[in-house]
């Protein structure tokens, strides 16, 4: 069975979060997708979304967030550039399918942004996340206002017993670490 999990990214201010959410392309290729932040006990808040219908490989930028939907591959790419400490939080990708409730994609992203010198954007050789060159022409898409109460989350488990770190061979640098935390089975 598919498990809903969190993947934890620890980055420094000024770096870029660069993640992907996969979806069933036969079902959702042209559906509108969104990037949301989930605050404990609150409704998820949509920060950016693709156009409707979603266009293939067409970057959409909303502030420091860039979404790119690769229809042919069933992948939504999400970049958050020039990260700030206040960007820390739990994020998720969803697919809008009105009149039905949004469909949540795996995995959730637990982003932790810390202060720390990371040089000028793109200059930090230790970073395993790259700073994205913002495309000259991007579209700002209008996002539906509703979000499903079902996607309200509980706080993730406090215990570290469920936390499994990546294999030792991976050698993620000390700038970027990823920890997978099962939320429920």
């Amino acid at each position: 069975a598919t498990k809903l999990t969190e993947e934890k990214y620890e980055l420094k201010e000024g770096q870029t979060l660069d993640v992907k959410c996969d979806y069933t392309l036969e079902k959702f290729a042209s559906s509108q997708k969104a990037w949301q932040i989930i605050r404990d006990g609150e409704m998820p808040k949509t920060l950016a979304c693709t156009e409707r219908p979603s266009k293939n490989s067409h970057p959409v930028q909303v502030g420091r967030i860039i979404l790119e939907d690769y229809h042919d591959h069933g992948l939504l790419r999400v970049r958050m550039v020039n990260l700030q400490v206040e960007d820390s939080g739990l994020y998720q990708c969803v697919i809008y399918q009105p009149p039905k409730e949004p469909h949540m994609l795996f995995d959730r992203i637990r982003l932790v942004v810390t202060k720390g010198f990371s040089g000028t954007p793109g200059s930090n050789e230790n970073s395993t996340q790259n700073v994205y060159k913002i495309p000259p022409t991007t579209t700002k898409a209008l996002c539906p206002l509703y979000t499903s109460p079902r996607t309200v989350t509980q706080a993730p488990p406090k215990s570290t017993a469920d936390v499994s770190t990546p294999d030792s061979e991976i050698n993620l640098t000390n700038v970027t670490d990823i920890i997978r935390v099962p939320v429920f089975n």
């Epitope: 498990k3 660069d18 992907k20 996969d22 790119e68 995995d107 992203i109 793109g122 700073v131």
Partner: antibody, heavy 123, light 107 residues
Amino acid sequence: QVQLVQSGAEVKKPGASVKVSCKASGYTFTSYDINWVRQATGQGLEWMGWMNPNSGNSGSVKKFRDRVTMTRDTSISTAYMELSSLRSEDTAVYYCVRLIGYSSAFKWSFQHWGQGTLVTVSS
Amino acid sequence: DIQMTQSPSSLSASVGDRVTITCQASRDISKYLNWYQQKPGKAPKLLIYDASNLETGVPSRFSGSGSGTDFTFTISSLQPEDFATYYCQHYDNIPITFGQGTRLEIK
């Protein structure tokens, strides 16, 4: 340690299908995407596509879209790549590969490779 | 699709030589570039990721640099075990593509 062990060499006739398996060990199978890369004899590397073993979702390049199916059996930590309507130009070594980062990372660095499976298509 | 052009396609060198291979992308790919080594009959091996980061266990004589469209892979002092084929690969977007390879032979 991370290991990807692939099934043995296959000889197929044009028009037939082949299913290559890739058994993973040494890590949590559902945490990392499996990709497939092929290499015709004496030629370069060609990326075919990816599969997320957790969600079961997959994607492939246009060239293979109508002919390739990527699946998995999480109970035995095994990924499969099936290529149908084989032609002579599909003769190649097929590799399954695990990425460096978790499945949510947009980081397509091919860190762990299977030993390869030679598929020969000949009448 | 982004085209990756490696040069030279082959080169001959001696043990102890400094060797440089270049890879040019058909458009800006930032630092989304990896380098691999492949020996005959073996699977490729990741050497460098994100243009300049050395993969764990890879000797420090291997290095990578560059960003945008032009990238360089260098072996500072060739060892006998370095004779192989080297490939660059981008992942700035989908689909992922590889360079055609550079075959490094003993002079």
